[in-house]
């Protein structure tokens, strides 16, 4: 799996999970979230050569096509596969609210 | 939806469905498929600016982050959303076989 256990420990230019910290105020301009200040969102990046963690038959076809016709720019792309939620604390007036924001943290990647 | 009805009728640099014909022998080197000779596979391509058909909360976060830090290459990517199968005819010896290859045709796209 193209997850932290593999990607963070290897030199990998191909599609893999990359660490990324997001600070809510600084990076997104979101001042409404009280806690946490930010979080490890991660992201997916890297090349998708033939058979590198292809998600579907179409992505396999496309990566094979791309090896023959690279100028077509019709290659698969490295995107998130498994995502996890993030629990946040915010306030409505003086009332604290705890909420789970779904699909906030990328745990693994795929070529799609 | 970023499908043929929208994408093939509009000039769209952002993430959208793009037409692509794949010839099995010429483009993939697949000589085993008897019929069809090729098919309209289509593919997804284009930029994913903030809120352009974002698939998840993470892709919305990422596209917003990318406006501030484009050099990070941490932007969402335009990938397939809905896929359809393709029915093919091939032979095992002299015996014809009809099979449905799943996820061969892209019908719509998303930023993920």
């Amino acid at each position: 799996a193209l997850d932290a256990a593999y990607c963070f420990r290897n030199v990998q230019d191909n599609c893999c999970l990359r660490p990324l910290y997001i600070d809510f105020k600084r990076d997104l301009g979101w001042k409404w979230i009280h806690e946490p200040k930010g979080y490890n969102a991660n992201f997916c990046a890297g090349a998708c050569p033939y058979l590198w963690s292809s998600d579907t038959q179409h992505s396999r076809v496309l990566s094979l096509y791309n090896t023959i016709n690279p100028e077509a720019s019709a290659s698969p792309c490295c995107v998130s596969q498994d995502l996890e939620p993030l629990t946040i604390l915010y306030y409505i007036g003086k009332t604290p609210k705890i909420e789970q924001l779904s699909n906030m943290i990328v745990k693994s990647c795929k070529c799609s | 939806a970023l499908d043929a009805a929208y994408c093939f009728r509009n000039v769209q640099d952002n993430c959208c469905l793009r037409p692509l014909y794949i010839d099995f022998k010429r483009d993939l080197g697949w000589k085993w498929i008897h019929e069809p000779k090729g098919y309209n596979a289509n593919f997804c391509a284009g930029a994913c600016p903030y809120l352009w058909s974002s698939d998840t909360q993470h892709s919305r976060v990422l596209s917003l982050y990318n406006t501030i830090n484009p050099e990070a290459s941490a932007s969402p990517c335009c990938v397939s959303q809905d896929l359809e199968p393709l029915t093919i005819l091939y032979y095992i010896g002299k015996t014809p076989k009809i099979e449905q290859l799943s996820n061969m045709i892209v019908k719509s796209c998303k930023c993920s």
Epitope: C7, F8, R9, N10, V11, Q12, D13, C16, R18, P19, L20, Y21, I22, D23, K25, R26, D27, K37, N40, A45, G46 | N69, P70, E71, A72, S73, A74
Partner: antibody, heavy 119, light 107 residues
Framework: EVTLKESGPVLVKPTETLTLTCTVS????????VHWVRQPPGKALEWMGL???????RYNSALKSRLTISKDTSKSQVVLTMTNMDPVDTATYYC?????????????WGPGTLVTVSS | DIQMTQSPSTLSASVGDRVTITCLAS??????LAWYQQKPGKSPKLLIY???SLQDGVPSRFSGSESGPEYTLTISSLQPDDFATYFC?????????FGQGTKVEIK
């Protein structure tokens, strides 16, 4: 064990180009970002620029026209190139890593290399 | 660029003293501040990040706090190993900027 080590010339003539190499171990350049920071003798630290795990770069606008940062992930090396060197560029040059890309503080530093610009 | 004004520039203290160093940011940096210790001929060592988070392996006598645009590094009981120069750094906006430094010397 995470380590970074700078190497390059100790003496550069004015108008010449400086090339420094940062060789890292214990982590991958496809996972972490690497920054360059310099410090003139007895003075404060100055952030110069960085190279992302994905290969993108960002430079201090005061130095942007003279700086290039690149990397060779297979060699675990980051290279700083600075053109048109001047005596005011005499400093100890450090490479450093941020603990998580976009955290923007530096948990590991190289020992630094003193570069003197003089004719 | 965000200016980081650090004070004092020099501080004379004795072992066991409580020491405070301040850093004033020219604009809001939303707690994105780090503190480093540097000894002569050595590279900086990270002590505190996010204004108050202690880096792994750093003694608990070091602490960080904030009040508006002013950030403070406190050493609760100065030890012989703490005589060094301390720098603050904002990690809020490009270009990341450092304070001018505070030299903590033996009284």
């Amino acid at each position: 064990e995470v380590t970074l080590k700078e190497s390059g010339p100790v003496l550069v003539k004015p108008t010449e180009t400086l090339t420094l190499t940062c060789t890292v171990s214990g982590f991958s350049l496809t996972t972490y970002n690497v920054h360059w920071v310099r410090q003139p003798p007895g003075k404060a630290l100055e952030w110069m620029g960085l190279i992302w795990n994905t290969g993108g770069t960002r430079y201090n606008s005061a130095l942007k026209s003279r700086l290039t940062i690149s990397k060779d992930t297979s060699k675990s090396q980051v290279v700083l190139t600075m053109t048109n060197m001047d005596p005011v560029d005499t400093a100890t040059y450090y490479c450093a890593r941020d603990p998580v890309p976009n955290k923007w503080h530096f948990d590991f530093w190289g020992p630094g290399t003193l570069v003197t610009v003089s004719s | 660029d965000i200016q980081m004004t650090q004070s004092p520039s020099t501080l004379s203290a004795s072992v066991g003293d409580r020491v405070t160093i301040t850093c004033l940011a020219s604009e809001d940096i939303y707690s994105n501040l780090a503190w480093y210790q540097q000894k002569p001929g050595k590279s900086p060592k990270l002590l505190i990040y996010d204004a108050r988070s202690l880096q792994d392996g750093v003694p608990s006598r070091f602490s960080g706090s904030e009040s508006g645009p002013e950030y403070t590094l406190t050493i609760s009981s100065l030890q012989p190993d703490d005589f060094a120069t301390y720098f603050c750094q904002q990690h809020h906006a490009y270009p990341f900027t450092f304070g001018q430094g505070t030299k903590v010397e033996i009284k």
